[in-house]
Interface confidence: medium
């Protein structure tokens, strides 16, 4: 049987096949993919802008940031208000004070420790 390079198309991930000769073809890949048949998802994480210890997770022609618990937002630049998330973070009447990348407790009546429990 006659071999036709682009029938069926060997290009994957939405790539477009173009016949370049009797037995040769070329794949034009969609943004985010590379390789002779567009088989590879390009790693978009080099020069990522995840901040505050965020980890870059590659996508297709984009990436996302996986943030540590104290940070949120697209690039982990927004502080999580632990005092709102944990109303009882401070014990024994202590006042919760949100800080960039964490929180602290202001203790009263002789109590001490990170959560005023000592």
């Amino acid at each position: 049987s006659l071999y036709v390079p682009c029938a069926p198309s060997p290009c994957v991930n939405g790539g477009t096949c173009r016949q370049t000769g009797d037995f040769t073809f070329e794949c034009n890949c969609l943004p985010g993919f590379e390789g002779s048949t567009c088989e590879r998802n390009i790693d978009d994480c080099p020069n990522h802008r995840c901040q505050n210890g965020g980890v870059c997770v590659d996508g297709v022609n984009t990436y996302n940031c996986r943030c540590p618990p104290q940070w949120t937002g697209q690039f982990c630049t927004e502080d999580v208000d632990e005092c709102l998330l944990q109303p009882n973070a401070c014990q024994n009447g202590g006042t919760c004070a949100n800080r960039n990348g964490g929180y602290g407790c202001v203790c009263v009546n002789g109590w001490s420790g990170d959560d005023c429990s000592e």
Epitope: P31, E34, I42, D43, D44, P46, N47, R49, Q51, N61, T62, Y63, Q74, F75, T77
Partner: antibody, heavy 117, light 112 residues
């Protein structure tokens, strides 16, 4: 679209701020770079302000000589102490992919800065 | 600082001919994020190609980009008078190791 303004004749040492005004897209999504071109010379990248993180990066030769800042619709380039070598057309250019530096697919017409005593 | 070298500062071609412009990087371009621009006098640069080989929307398929790593090429086939311009390569590099972006010195294409 993007359009530069503020270019004029200045004497050496006189600080000058150029403004790039954008419309039709958000500066919170796209990186913006400044590029210059001296008369009859090639393109020279000055620096970038990144979308989202607002991180600034400058070309090694440009550090301390230029300052980039932005508002919601403008990107400024301050030439801190111009010298005659800073005579050039200054272009504002938008990154072509959201949150990736990559390439520049939208350029302003440029604004001419002439530094002379 | 990262450097992009365009070996020829000018090239000449006949109408209908082929022009090849080379661009060499001093270190690897991030993910082949290498672009080509066309600039005519008094105008800003116009994006032709990005990602080393992806044609920008609306640009003639006579323009073809190839290469990877540190060696890249722009080929113009079936050269037309309108192709007379200066062509620049531009690459993205790791910001952590120096300049994020660099341009080549440009190659002027003249039509015979």
């Amino acid at each position: 679209s993007v359009e530069e303004s503020g270019g004029r004749l200045v004497t050496p040492g006189t600080p000058l701020t150029l403004t790039c005004t954008v419309s039709g897209f958000s500066l919170s999504s796209y990186d913006m770079s400044w590029v210059r071109q001296a008369p009859g010379k090639g393109l020279e990248w000055i620096g970038i302000i990144q979308a989202g993180s607002n991180t600034l990066f400058y070309a090694s030769w440009a550090k301390g000589r230029f300052t980039i800042s932005k508002t919601s619709t403008t990107v400024d380039l301050k030439i801190t102490s111009p010298t005659t070598e800073d005579t050039a057309t200054y272009f504002c250019a938008r990154g072509g992919v959201i949150f990736i530096i990559g390439h520049f697919n939208l350029w302003g017409p440029g604004t001419l800065v002439t530094v002379s005593s | 600082a990262q450097v992009l070298t365009q070996t020829a500062s000018s090239v000449s071609a006949a109408v209908g001919g082929t022009v090849t412009i080379n661009c060499q990087a001093s270190q690897s371009v991030v993910n082949n994020r290498l672009a080509w621009y066309q600039q005519k006098p008094g105008q800003p640069p116009k994006l032709l190609m990005y990602g080393a080989s992806t044609l920008e929307s609306g640009v003639s398929s006579r323009f073809k980009g190839s290469g990877s790593g540190t060696q890249f090429t722009l080929t113009i086939s079936g050269v037309q008078c309108d192709d007379a311009a200066t062509y620049y390569c531009q690459g993205e590099f790791l910001c952590s190791s120096g300049d994020c972006v660099a341009f080549g010195g440009g190659t002027k294409v003249e039509i015979k």
